[in-house]
């Protein structure tokens, strides 16, 4: 998995008038990291993990950068012609990555009302756009605006390729992010389903990185994919992830089923609690 920094900026217009507020979210290695969601942007770390990465400092630099980008995107939205009545959004997503071999990737993507209409590879400076005529019109509109003023273009790109990578490297220097492994807490619960059946659910939480194997086994053999229900692997707001898997089994056969968990080379099996014990927790070392 490469290390990545992802900026997601959103500005809105109402009946052709660009709104003063904007929303900015920054993800570090896929985790919510910073957020600005007020009329006046104030970079807020998303949880203790983000604070640890940023260190004991104010976030003036981040606030300044994010505010500047928000203003630039509002100006871009103001120049989009043919804005219909009602609510419209312009979204810009910038991503930079550092791979294990130290190679880098950077890209920028624009979305209007949630639809992608323009992308740029920030290393080759190559632009691409979808084939639809609406996307092409929007893309030409935005590219022309960005070309109008070289200085404007420069400020708009001030946190792009080089700066994005510089910020990413700065965050990685904290050591908090760098190839950290946090093992999951696994707990198994049971609930009555239909007569004679129970639903058993295995939850893994608080783990990093996000790659995990979680599955139900009967007598040591995996149940087929279609007999299990999986939850998405989702950020839990603490810089770690959570997920679950559930299946339906016959009451009285609980002892034959185990939840198998594998994460970062470690593995463990977790039995179904019997009788009235509702939760069984275990945390491998």
């Amino acid at each position: 998995e490469p290390h990545s920094l992802r900026y997601n900026l959103t500005v809105l217009s109402w009946d052709g008038s660009v709104q003063s507020g904007f929303l900015t979210e920054v993800h570090l290695d896929g985790q919510p990291f910073l957020r600005c969601d007020r009329q006046k942007c104030r970079a807020k770390p998303q949880g203790q993990w983000a604070e640890d990465v940023l260190g004991n400092k104010t976030w003036d630099r981040e606030t300044r950068d994010l505010t500047g980008n928000g203003k630039d995107l509002r100006m871009t939205l103001a120049h989009i012609k043919d804005q219909k009545e009602g609510l419209h959004s312009l979204q810009e997503i910038r991503v930079c990555e550092i791979h294990e071999d130290n190679s880098t990737r950077s890209s920028q993507h624009f979305y209007y009302d949630g639809e992608l209409f323009l992308s740029q590879n920030l290393e080759t400076k190559e632009w691409t756009m979808p084939q639809s005529s609406r996307a092409q019109t929007l893309a030409m509109n935005v590219r022309n605006f960005l070309k109008e003023d070289a200085m404007k273009t420069k400020t708009h790109y001030h946190a792009m390729h080089a700066d994005c990578l510089q910020e990413l490297r700065r965050y990685l220097k904290s050591g908090v992010v760098l190839r950290r492994t946090v093992p999951p807490m696994v707990n198994v619960t049971r609930s009555e389903a239909s007569e004679g059946n129970i639903t058993v659910t295995c939850r893994a939480s608080g783990f990093y990185p996000w790659n995990i194997t979680l599955s139900w086994r009967q007598d040591g053999v995996s149940l087929s994919h279609d007999t299990q229900q999986w939850g998405d692997v989702l950020p839990d707001g603490n810089g770690t992830y959570q997920t679950w898997v559930a299946t339906r089994i016959c009451q009285g056969e609980e002892q034959r089923f185990t939840c198998y968990m594998e994460h970062s080379g470690n593995h463990s099996t977790h039995p179904v609690p019997s009788g009235k014990v509702l939760v069984l927790q275990s945390h491998w070392q």
Epitope: Q218, D219, G220, V221, L223, S224, D226, T227, C250, R256
Partner: antibody, heavy 122, light 106 residues
């Protein structure tokens, strides 16, 4: 006594079909996951199919996928293997085997039948 | 599919010898590994499950160890009735057997 008895083997022409049966006694078949394993003359063991107790998880080895079908009838205490499009290389002794239900088991087969011989000739 | 490779494919030993058979998986299988003994014309018999747990009724001279990709079956002191073929089997991803190790009299 806990035991498994296979039947249905015999001589069949290449491209033909056979249905093997395995009858359980001494234990409640419906509680157990079951398998078919075969052994070609002078060769090692080859697992070919698995069916769990509720028949909602079924697996096949690549060598038989699409040609063989595993099924069970718990009321008749029987496990079956329908074999179609038989080939010369399917010639073997076919065993049915029970998956142990001991806590902490890892898909181990604790009870085996005596085997039934299938010979495919071209 | 996971491949199971047993070594050696055959070995000659004497009564009283300590015998070690290894089984290697093509990828990590945790402890989802079982060992069987088969004598000519007979069905296989379960010896060890979960890599190291002794099946009920099996003599304590048989032991298993290992986790991940490398596993070992050890017979501490070979007895006349132990001359047979031994197979490992994994259940981590569906099911597969190793190629077998024949133990015969030296």
């Amino acid at each position: 006594e806990v035991q498994l008895v296979e039947s249905g083997g015999g001589l069949v022409q290449s491209g033909g079909s056979l249905r093997l049966s395995c009858v359980a006694s001494g234990f409640t078949l419906s509680r157990y996951s079951m398998n078919w394993v075969r052994q070609a003359p002078g060769k090692g063991l080859e697992w070919i199919s698995y069916i769990n107790s509720r028949s909602n998880t079924i697996y096949y080895a690549d060598s038989v996928k699409g040609r063989f079908t595993i099924s069970r009838d718990n009321a008749k205490k029987s496990l079956y293997l329908q074999m179609n499009s038989l080939r010369d290389e399917d010639t073997a002794v076919y065993y049915c085997a029970r998956v142990s239900d001991i806590t902490g088991n890892t898909g181990a087969f604790d009870i085996w039948g005596q085997g039934t011989t299938v010979t495919v000739s071209s | 599919d996971i491949q199971m490779t047993q070594s050696p494919s055959s070995l000659s030993a004497s009564v009283g010898d300590r015998v070690t058979i290894t089984c290697r998986a093509s990828q990590s299988i945790s402890s989802y590994l079982n060992w069987y003994q088969q004598k000519p014309g007979k069905a296989p018999k379960l010896l060890i499950y979960a890599a190291s747990s002794l099946q009920s009724g099996v003599p304590s001279r048989f032991s298993g160890s290992g986790s991940g990709t490398d596993f070992t079956l050890t017979i501490s002191s070979l007895q006349p009735e132990d001359f047979a073929t031994y197979y490992c089997q994994q259940s981590y991803s569906t099911l597969t057997f190793g190629g077998g190790t024949k133990v015969d009299i030296k």
